[in-house]
Interface confidence: medium
Amino acid sequence: SSSPTSSASSFSSSAPFLASAVSAQPPLPDQCPALCECSEAARTVKCVNRNLTEVPTDLPAYVRNLFLTGNQLAVLPAGAFARRPPLAELAALNLSGSRLDEVRAGAFEHLPSLRQLDLSHNPLADLSPFAFSGSNASVSAPSPLVELILNHIVPPEDERQNRSFEGMVVAALLAGRALQGLRRLELASNHFLYLPRDVLAQLPSLRHLDLSNNSLVSLTYVSFRNLTHLESLHLEDNALKVLHNGTLAELQGLPHIRVFLDNNPWVCDCHMADMVTWLKETEVVQGKDRLTCAYPEKMRNRVLLELNSADLDCDPILPPSLQTS
């Protein structure tokens, strides 16, 4: 995850009384919630591995970096971080590994400076389409988010709703066009089988896109054309068999792009010829000399860059009467 780590050395710890105790008084400016460590100098609050079941109500107004990792939050309701006065300076929020399975509409409302959000390693069975946009308007107020880290948020098979997990995540990314300013999106390790075709076109500011360690088989219907500022595209450890001409041309047309393609089961048959030719000429693929064939069996572990057209044949398709099992 790319969430910030504090360099604070002067943390003060609060007394370990119940985390759910809510003071009727407005919190003192230098108050530190129970079970948390606070450093006003570093503008950082850490409530880490404390089995909290809800977000502390008495967070200090100075907080810029908030770590709520390793807890048992289960649900983030609407306005989970709404405070009076608001947490106007909160810029980085890390909720990774906190057993969240539901994030409701408007969970991150009233955080005007929130630039970095990490929800990784939570089994998000129910991510509201309006989790990030806050409202169901067709065009919402722009979110200040610049980095959204959603690695390994796929719930176990038996906890999934009867709907596409990919579709649920994409609906949240696209709702109200609120994330037009998003520059980094990490979606690694989510068992994605496909990427809905409209998602990238609506995130025009993306610089970094991480789709590594998914189960993507093809990019045929995915368009990268609008992502003119994309710097890195991580597609390692997927199920990609070949990249076709349209995709190759789009990637080559992106002026800053670096693509990472390691550990995909490339199928080295006649359909691979265009990709091999492209790989030999392009500079956009990082570590291209490490790409090897997985199929067919006779080609296994052959280096793609060392192949020529004679190596890339397709076995003739036999008429049904001649096929044997």
Partner: antibody
Framework: QVQLVQSGAEVKKPGASVKVSCKAS????????IIWVRQATGQGLEWMGW????????GYAQKFQGRVSMTRNTSINTAYMELSTLRSEDTALYYC?????????WGQGTLVTVSS | DIQMTQSPSSLSASVGDRVTITCRAS??????LAWFQQKPGKTPKRLIY???NLQSGVPSRFSGSGSGTEFTLTIRSLQPEDFATYYC?????????FGQGTKVEIK
């Protein structure tokens, strides 16, 4: 919070080499390019090159080609810039910065003085 | 290499003035341009990216415009803390190139 902390000032003789380090913290080091920019006293900013910490790939401005080397040690989240065959006109403040397009976070700068 | 020409190289202005700095690219760079502010003895600070997007935390009196080869940084009402040197940077092509800088001084 994101921080880039550079090594201390250096005084070198003409013809020598200098190696400046840049230690990153507060983010995942391998996900952003590190660039190097220099600034002679009272002068403007001069882009020297980039290094991708994940792959180790680099690109240098023509002016420094053959004389500069940008490397990294990912185990300690540190980038390095080595400039060889120093001459007096290399006296400058050398900055590392995060980001391959427009840099967003900068190191505090390392003053390199080349003097006989 | 793409040349970035900034004008003027320096200017004198008073608090409250509207200030405009121009950056011209030797070839089209779409909107791949950023503006930085640098005060003496300090590191550069990014103000604007993608020609017109305001960096979070930067006062709204700063704005950027332009596309292709002509770009402008405008400070709507100059404040005492705005006296500094301003640089443009193109990131459309390698090598990246900065403008030579515009020094904004107190009149």
């Amino acid at each position: 919070q994101v921080q880039l902390v550079q090594s201390g000032a250096e005084v070198k003789k003409p013809g020598a080499s200098v190696k400046v380090s840049c230690k990153a913290s507060g983010y995942t080091f391998t996900t952003y390019d590190i660039i190097w920019v220099r600034q002679a006293t009272g002068q403007g900013l001069e882009w020297m090159g980039w290094m991708n910490p994940k792959s180790g790939n680099t690109g240098y401005a023509q002016k420094f080609q053959g004389r500069v080397s940008m490397t990294r040690n990912t185990s300690i989240n540190t980038a390095y810039m080595e400039l060889s065959t120093l001459r007096s006109e290399d006296t400058a403040l050398y900055y590392c910065a995060r980001g391959g397009l427009e840099p967003d976070y900068w190191g505090q700068g390392t003053l390199v003085t080349v003097s006989s | 290499d793409i040349q970035m020409t900034q004008s003027p190289s320096s200017l004198s202005a008073s608090v409250g003035d509207r200030v405009t700095i121009t950056c011209r690219a030797s070839q089209g760079i779409r909107n791949d341009l950023a503006w930085f502010q640098q005060k003496p003895g300090k590191t550069p600070k990014r103000l604007i990216y993608d020609a017109s997007n305001l960096q979070s935390g930067v006062p709204s009196r700063f704005s950027g415009s332009g596309s292709g080869t002509e770009f402008t940084l405008t400070i709507r009402s100059l404040q005492p803390e705005d006296f500094a040197t301003y640089y443009c940077l193109q990131y459309n092509r390698y090598p990246r190139t900065f403008g030579q800088g515009t020094k904004v001084e107190i009149k």
